[in-house]
């Protein structure tokens, strides 16, 4: 199973509201999880059906979340980053990179 | 998108074994814990055992963090395949009170959200399970 990276990326800006069940979506990676080769980056490894995510419809599993509110992404430990998520407030934008 | 295949239930006598296995099949990215559930007749579907997987430099390793229920702990050992991303129970010493039902399930990353607790994304169909 190889997670290289060797792919066509496009950058996208997405803001989300948050829903009354959240935000509705999984992360994976970190500097103490690393899921894709040479690449501690947080990636999206789910997407909850009917959740504000999911309802948006541009937010996809495999997108890489480069930031959140502006707040830069990389090096951050994997519980780091969930924490981040969870206050980052009703408003959420999010800077991902989608394969292609 | 995820397939779950459970295999090896049956009717065995109390004091036997059995191996369950569990194949996944389909995205196998961001996949980060793999577990057994079973669930009685009448009863609630209960954890049975949990493995957590290992990614480093993009591939899955093995050694993940193993955890069983107090009721299974010294009888059942949980482990995975990697190449072959099946997980496996192998169920020693049964007791009639192990009769259930035997799903399978994967979780996919943490829950960005508090009120989502991390619960498991993706079940198998089951396997049944019966001591005599």
């Known amino acids: 199973m190889n997670g290289r990276v060797d792919y066509l990326v496009t950058e996208e800006e997405i803001n989300l509201t948050r829903g009354p069940s959240g935000l509705g979506f999984n992360i994976v990676g970190g500097t103490d999880q690393q899921y894709v080769s040479n690449d501690s980056g947080i990636y999206v490894s789910r997407i909850k059906e009917n959740g504000a995510a999911a309802l948006d419809g541009r937010l996809q599993e495999g997108d890489k979340i480069l930031s959140v509110n502006g707040q830069d992404l990389k090096n951050l430990l994997h519980q780091d980053a969930v924490d981040l998520f969870r206050n980052a407030g009703y408003a959420v934008s999010l800077r991902v990179q989608h394969r292609l | 998108q995820v397939q779950l295949v459970e295999s090896g239930g049956g009717l065995v006598q109390a004091g036997g074994s059995l191996r369950l296995s569990c194949a996944a099949s389909g995205r196998t990215f961001g996949m980060s814990t793999m577990g057994w559930f079973r669930q009685a007749p009448g009863k609630e579907r209960e954890l049975v055992s949990t493995?957590?997987?290992?990614?480093?430099?993009?591939?899955?390793?093995?050694?993940?963090?193993?955890h069983y229920a107090d009721s299974v702990k010294g009888r059942f050992t949980i482990s995975r395949d990697d190449a072959k991303n099946t997980v496996y129970l192998q169920m020693d010493s049964l007791k009639p009170e192990d009769t259930a039902f035997y799903y399978c399930?994967?979780?996919?990353?943490?829950?960005?959200?508090?009120?989502?607790?991390?619960?498991?994304?993706?079940w198998g169909q089951g396997t049944q399970v019966t001591v005599s």
């Open positions: 399930a994967a979780r996919f990353g943490s829950s960005v959200d508090v009120i989502i607790p991390d619960d498991y994304d993706y």
């Open positions: 493995i957590s997987i290992i990614w480093r430099d993009g591939r899955t390793q093995s050694g993940g963090r193993t």
